[in-house]
Interface confidence: medium
């Protein structure tokens, strides 16, 4: 028969042959042959693989470093990574929670919608058209663009969500 060019779900193609992938929590030891099945081994302690795979090495569980204010929220298994969170009163700097802040800053282009409290973190919002923030701040709201017209000036450079408009003198018509 013709060698396959594609395999079923949870299989992979190798040496013109469809082999079974290893299930989550196991790593590949050897590919299947005409006569043998794919050989897989369970991940070791503190390791995991979360998909059907042909990986020869399991991934290390994430380390929740107490020096960064992190602690374990959910212990990893052979099929799932460890989930970290921050010590009480601290907040994750990102969804991945790789470090902690007392309260998060809003990046340039974002303003503070709500300042952090003892229990809730800073809430940021994107600066809408007509407003900007050029700083990383845990307190500052988006500022409105300067109104050139009220200063009898014209817009020389348009504003963005991160920069104010640049005003300049009006062109005087020559006689």
């Amino acid at each position: 028969p013709e060698p396959p060019t594609a395999c079923r779900e949870k299989q992979y193609l190798i040496n013109s042959q469809c082999c079974s992938l290893c299930q989550p929590g196991q790593k590949l030891v050897s590919d299947c042959t005409e006569f043998t099945e794919t050989e897989c081994l369970p991940c070791g302690e503190s390791e995991f693989l979360d998909t059907w795979n042909r990986e020869t090495h399991c991934h290390q569980h994430k380390y929740c470093d107490p020096n960064l204010g992190l602690r374990v929220q959910q212990k990893g298994t052979s099929e799932t990574d460890t989930i970290c969170t921050c010590e009480e009163g601290w907040h994750c700097t990102s969804e991945a929670c790789e470090s902690c802040v007392l309260h998060r800053s809003c990046s340039p282009g974002f303003g503070v919608k709500q300042i952090a409290t003892g229990v809730s973190d800073t809430i940021c919002e994107p600066c809408p058209v007509g407003f900007f923030s050029n700083v990383s701040s845990a307190f500052e709201k988006c500022h409105p663009w300067t109104s050139c017209e009220t200063k009898d000036l014209v817009v020389q450079q348009a504003g963005t969500n991160k920069t104010d408009v640049v005003c300049g003198p009006q062109d005087r018509l020559r006689a």
């Epitope: 921050c86 601290w90 700097t93 802040v101 007392l102 309260h103 800053s105 700083v135 701040s137 307190f139």
Partner: nanobody, 116 residues
């Protein structure tokens, strides 16, 4: 290397005043929002006050509003906290901070004790 050195703490009676200073070095001071935070004995860290890089905007925790004033002198790379009408509950180690990351640059702190 970033360094923050607080000073000005001490023992003061309730109702008294103190002025804390924080000398900064190793970074461009005026680029950063600066903060004061404190840790009371046996308690967690509490944010106290912050000031924008240019010094024009200030922010305070409700517990110190109207009593404490934050300021900065960018020409001297120094942050200040003027503390008036001090109460027993203001007793804490006060730290100035460049950013509020858990592991970021913090000073050693200066102890303020309010007691009669």
């Amino acid at each position: 290397e970033v360094q923050l050195l607080e000073s000005g703490g001490g023992l003061v009676q309730p109702g008294g005043s103190l002025r804390l200073s924080c000398a900064a070095s190793g970074f461009t001071f005026e680029w950063y929002e600066m903060q004061w935070v404190r840790r009371a004995p046996g308690k967690g860290l509490e944010w106290v006050s912050a000031i924008s890089g240019d010094g024009y905007r200030t922010y305070y925790a409700d517990s110190v509003k109207g009593r404490f004033t934050i300021s900065r002198d960018n020409s001297k790379n120094t942050l200040y906290l003027q503390m008036n009408s001090l109460r027993a509950e203001d007793t804490a180690v006060y730290y100035c901070a460049k950013e509020l990351l858990y592991f970021d640059y913090w000073g050693r702190g200066t102890l303020v004790t309010v007691s009669s």
